[in-house]
Interface confidence: low
Amino acid sequence: FKIEISPEYKTIAQIGDSMALTCSTTGCESPLFSWRTQIDSPLNAKVRTEGSKSVLTMEPVSFENEHSYLCTATCGSGKLERSIHVDIYSFPKDPEIQFSGPLEVGKPVTVKCLAPDIYPVYRLEIDLFKGDQLMNRQEFSSEEMTKSLETKSLEVTFTPVIEDIGKALVCRAKLHIDQIDSTLKERETVKELQVYISPRNTTISVHPSTRLQEGGAVTMTCSSEGLPAPEIFWGRKLDNEVLQLLSGNATLTLIAMRMEDSGVYVCEGVNLIGRDKAEVELVVQEKPFIVDISPGSQVAAQVGDSVVLTCAAIGCDSPSFSWRTQTDSPLNGVVRNEGAKSTLVLSSVGFEDEHSYLCAVTCLQRTLEKRTQVEVYSFPEDPVIKMSGPLVHGRPVTVNCTVPNVYPFDHLEIELLKGETTLMKKYFLEEMGIKSLETKILETTFIPTIEDTGKSLVCLARLHSGEMESEPKQRQSVQPLYVNVAPKETTIWVSPSPILEEGSPVNLTCSSDGIPAPKILWSRQLNNGELQPLSENTTLTFMSTKRDDSGIYVCEGINEAGISRKSVELIIQVSPKDIQLTVFPSKSVKEGDTVIISCTCGNVPETWIILKKKAKTGDMVLKSVDGSYTIRQAQLQDAGIYECESKTEVGSQLRSLTLDVKGKEHNKDYFSPE
């Protein structure tokens, strides 16, 4: 039979790894395996045998596994042996690069390259490169052989230069053991150089000057060179040399400076590796202490408004304030002191607040006083323009311009203008000394003309505030003018004619001039004189006239300025027809009877009917009432022919009858001689 061992002859294992040695036979059914070290030390491994194969596993590999291992296989009476040598090593990590401090240009720094947990050390070589330049190399071949893991290092001291920025530092470690595959044999670490420059050349520029006056401002700008660019800090040296930090900007602006702001101001450029300072001394000179009162020496306040008087002490640290009125009247306001400022608040001012107010400021032993005059006024609304009526060309109109709730009215002026022309101006100067809100009126009368249309009435109210201001307070109201013209030249056209035959058509057309254009109203005049409205059209049309359409028709032109009236009489004529002449009780009566003779015409008023009695001497017209003639006691001479005639411009109709009167004694008829 045969025996084989794998790996053959010699192998190498890294401390801490796992390693398996396999012993196998061929040509033997069930061999017996045994393992031992050449010097019979402990195996420090586990054995697992299956059939014709036995595996020796070292897990983890340690120094105790650095031996020659022998595998013995027994098959019946035959025995075969194979040996394998196990070398161990340790090279578990990439080297480390350490710096003694930050890499500052011009300052030496030590770089250390460490190779940790190495075995065997005498096989180690460490190289240190800066860019392509080999800075140092060390071989550890002369080191004593010890069975332990060691960390070895290589040190180099160099002085960084600006050109080093961006270069790489490479630390390369090699373990010279032939069996190791190349990836394990060599390890390296690369670190890019971060080079710093400590702040330097720190300078301060001051604008406008290092000598300043109280209340002034100064801007100081600081610059400092370094890498990375230094952060700028501004501070101020206090009495105890403590630095009071003020700003983290390159520019420090101090405003509203006081004498106490005098001192040494320090600018510091700071980066990761250092700091650099520059100092400047500021001198703030005293400014005389003054008192300022605002809003000004005179204040105009509208009744009901709130007024804030502010008294400020400029150039004084801890002033004391007092307020009074010139007449020593009670103060109606609230005083609030805040530092170098005092306010007097007069809320909802009235006439009683109209005073000279004095603010006294005491600074150390010196007192200054400043006064302001509060003048109260009321001028809350625009003027109101009112007119006595609509504007009609040629008709006088009264205009009122009212200025409500005004004070002081001895400073009031009201002006009324028509277009550019002043109609009236009124100065209210006669009521001095009265303290109340009053409504003032300017009233004037003018005669509008058609030319005024398009112009405007302007009421201008000015409240002059005494000496307080050059420009008076001014309010105005504007009313555009529109002048009306009353209707005139109202004209009626009747087509074809005002006298017509019944059934004819007729158009009555009316026109009237005025501004605004008059509205037309057609009416019919009733018997009692009242007008019955018919139409608002310009033309009143009858398609087929009737007798009842006869009458007086009135056309009115109406606008805001007035009425113009014109009338026309329409006469509708008819041809008489259907005349009936009757006698009651009969055509033959006795002497002394009452007889009624009636004449009616169907389509003509009774007044047009004429009743006559024929006689030789001539016809006698009878006095009829409603077409009836009554004979109270018939006489013989009442007998005769009676005739009824209906007559118009268009035609006439005639009817007649014979009345017979019998005498009482003779009982015989009496006929008229005709």
């Epitope: 101020r236 206090l238 403590v242 009071q244 930090l245 003020l246 700003s247 405003i255 106490e260």
Partner: nanobody, 125 residues
Framework: QVQLQESGGGSVQAGGSLRLSCTAS????????MSWVRQAPGKGLEWVSG????????YYADSVKGRFTISRDNAKNTLYLQMNSLKSEDTALYYC??????????????????KGQGTQVTVSS
């Protein structure tokens, strides 16, 4: 005229929270370090916290570290102090001021370090 106006103070039980605000006007707020300082009854001014111009660096007194947070909003010209886990020893008048100390803060009346009128914080146990 430099003006600083604090607000947000009040009375709170121990362990409670408050948020103080300070609105600045009359100077270029975004160019200045800012601080919160406080004055307990009968005591001098004590620096509480500071912040740099853009808010990237903050500084705290040991007595408030981990409980107070300083921040700023340059667009609104406003400085804030978030106070959590308040203790009775935090009772004081709190001022905001220009300038900052990393570990100590003095604001003498004569120095150019304007502070506001203050806002009262009262913590009862």
């Amino acid at each position: 005229q430099v003006q600083l106006q604090e607000s947000g103070g009040g009375s709170v039980q121990a362990g409670g929270s408050l948020r103080l605000s300070c609105t600045a006007s009359g100077f270029t707020y975004s160019s200045y370090y800012m601080s919160w300082v406080r004055q307990a009854p009968g005591k001098g001014l004590e620096w509480v916290s500071g912040i740099n111009v853009d808010g990237s660096n903050t500084y705290y007194a040991d007595s408030v570290k981990g409980r107070f947070t300083i921040s700023r909003d340059n667009a609104k010209n406003t400085l804030y102090l978030q106070m959590n886990s308040l203790k009775s020893e935090d009772t004081a008048l709190y001022y905001c001021a220009t300038g900052s100390g990393r570990d100590s803060y003095d604001c003498y009346s004569g120095s150019w370090c304007p502070k506001g009128q203050g806002t009262q914080v009262t913590v009862s146990s």
